[in-house]
């Protein structure tokens, strides 16, 4: 009797178990009692990345330079093009359809992780003993100056945004 379920890499149609098309190929005609499934390779600008019964291949993603995108990896008949962002920009989503400038860490915050083409800058608050007095996408929190090592004393305490101010020690009279 006609099958109700098919093996892996097959599909059921008209009571037939037909072979799926391999990645990189699209379906031209279903199998019959007397013939195999017929498949054709995707064209140069197209792909299919799974065993499939698609009658159309998918277009490769276009990395639009107007959106700050560039090609990270060229697509094949079996894989999509991978886009990344130009320097100074990162993707707005996992699918990387557009780019935005890396954010800068405000004063009082330092760069924990420098941005890449696919991830934004990660900032962290400067802990006690550290400061950042600039808005930057690259600079980490810097340690307060150690007055003691310069044989000086703290004249003005540091904050997360400012360094300590050192001064000479008072002379004993």
């Amino acid at each position: 009797e006609p099958p109700t379920a098919c093996r892996e890499k097959q599909y059921l149609i008209n009571s037939q178990c037909c072979s799926l098309c391999q990645p990189g190929q699209k379906l031209v005609s279903d199998c019959t009692e007397f013939t195999e499934t017929e498949c054709l390779p995707c064209s140069e600008s197209e792909f299919l990345d799974t065993w499939n019964r698609e009658t159309r291949c998918h277009q490769h993603k276009y990395c639009d330079p107007n959106l700050g995108l560039q090609v990270q990896q060229k697509g094949t008949s079996e894989t999509d093009t991978i886009c990344t962002c130009e320097e100074g920009l990162h993707c707005t989503s996992e699918s990387c359809e557009s780019c935005v400038p890396h954010r800068s860490c405000l004063p009082g915050f330092g760069v924990k992780q420098i941005a890449t083409g696919v991830s934004d800058t990660i900032c962290e608050p400067c802990p006690v003993g550290f400061f950042s007095n600039v808005s930057s996408a690259f600079e980490k929190c810097r340690p307060w100056t150690s007055c003691e090592t310069k044989d000086l004393v703290v004249q003005q305490a540091g904050t997360n945004k400012t360094d300590v101010v050192c001064g000479p020690q008072d002379r004993q009279r």
Epitope: S29, E33, F34, T35
Partner: antibody
């Protein structure tokens, strides 16, 4: 249901061209399947002559030595057989078939 | 060409008894995908052939379950578990793995 019906002259003179048409109903010949011509000489077995595919491409039996042509008219959902330079040996019942469905067959006699 | 040899060429069976027909090919009928396109047909007296079994062992729709097909490679068998009067006619195997498609010479089944 799929139905196939052969039509054409029942008598052909030697050296002339045999022409038959198969009209298909219940299924488009451009959708899928291979559309075959098969013949059966009197008291003998079946011989595959060739097919035209759903996409219009062909395959023929080399034993017929380039005498056979299968074509189609998609607007009428028909496919046709032409067999040139016929002899008495081409006298047979001619069937058009999708293989799961067959026409009822038409007898062609080659005689002067 | 794949030459198809059927045995026996004739068979006389008592109703209710089993019958078996063999079809042997001169070359393997398994294709590169592991599929085997071997089919069985029955041609009843005065009728067109009708499909019984396709792809070695699949019964075509409407075919009684007393008909079964088996085999692989080059050796194939059609079995009728309990022959009935309506089963009389000529049984053909047909391979469509290789072009040209080729038929067995036929096995005539009669009722005792």
């Amino acid at each position: 249901e799929v139905q196939l019906q052969e039509s054409g002259p029942g008598l052909v003179k030697p050296s002339e061209t045999l022409s038959l048409t198969c009209t298909v109903s219940g299924y488009s010949i451009t959708s899928n399947y291979y559309w075959n011509w098969i013949r059966q000489p009197p008291g003998k077995g079946l011989e595959w002559m060739g097919y035209i595919r759903y996409d219009g491409s062909n395959n023929y039996n080399p034993s017929l030595k380039n005498r056979v042509t299968i074509s189609r008219d998609t607007s009428k959902n028909q496919f046709s057989l032409k067999l040139s330079s016929v002899t008495a040996a081409d006298t047979a019942v001619y069937y058009c078939a999708r293989l799961d469905y067959w026409g009822q067959g038409t007898t062609v006699t080659v005689s002067s | 060409d794949a030459v198809m040899t059927q045995t026996p060429l004739s068979l006389s069976v008592t109703p209710g008894q089993p019958a078996s027909i063999s079809c042997r090919s001169s070359q393997s009928l398994e294709n590169t995908n592991g599929n085997t396109f071997l089919n069985w047909f029955l041609q009843k007296p005065g009728q067109s052939p009708q499909l019984l079994i396709y792809r070695v062992s699949n019964r075509f729709s409407g075919v009684p379950d007393r008909f079964s097909g088996s085999g692989s490679g080059t050796d194939f068998t059609l079995k009728i578990s309990r022959v009935e009067a309506e089963d009389v006619g000529v049984y053909f195997c047909l391979q469509v793995t290789h072009v040209p498609f080729t038929f067995g010479q036929g096995t005539k089944l009669e009722i005792k």
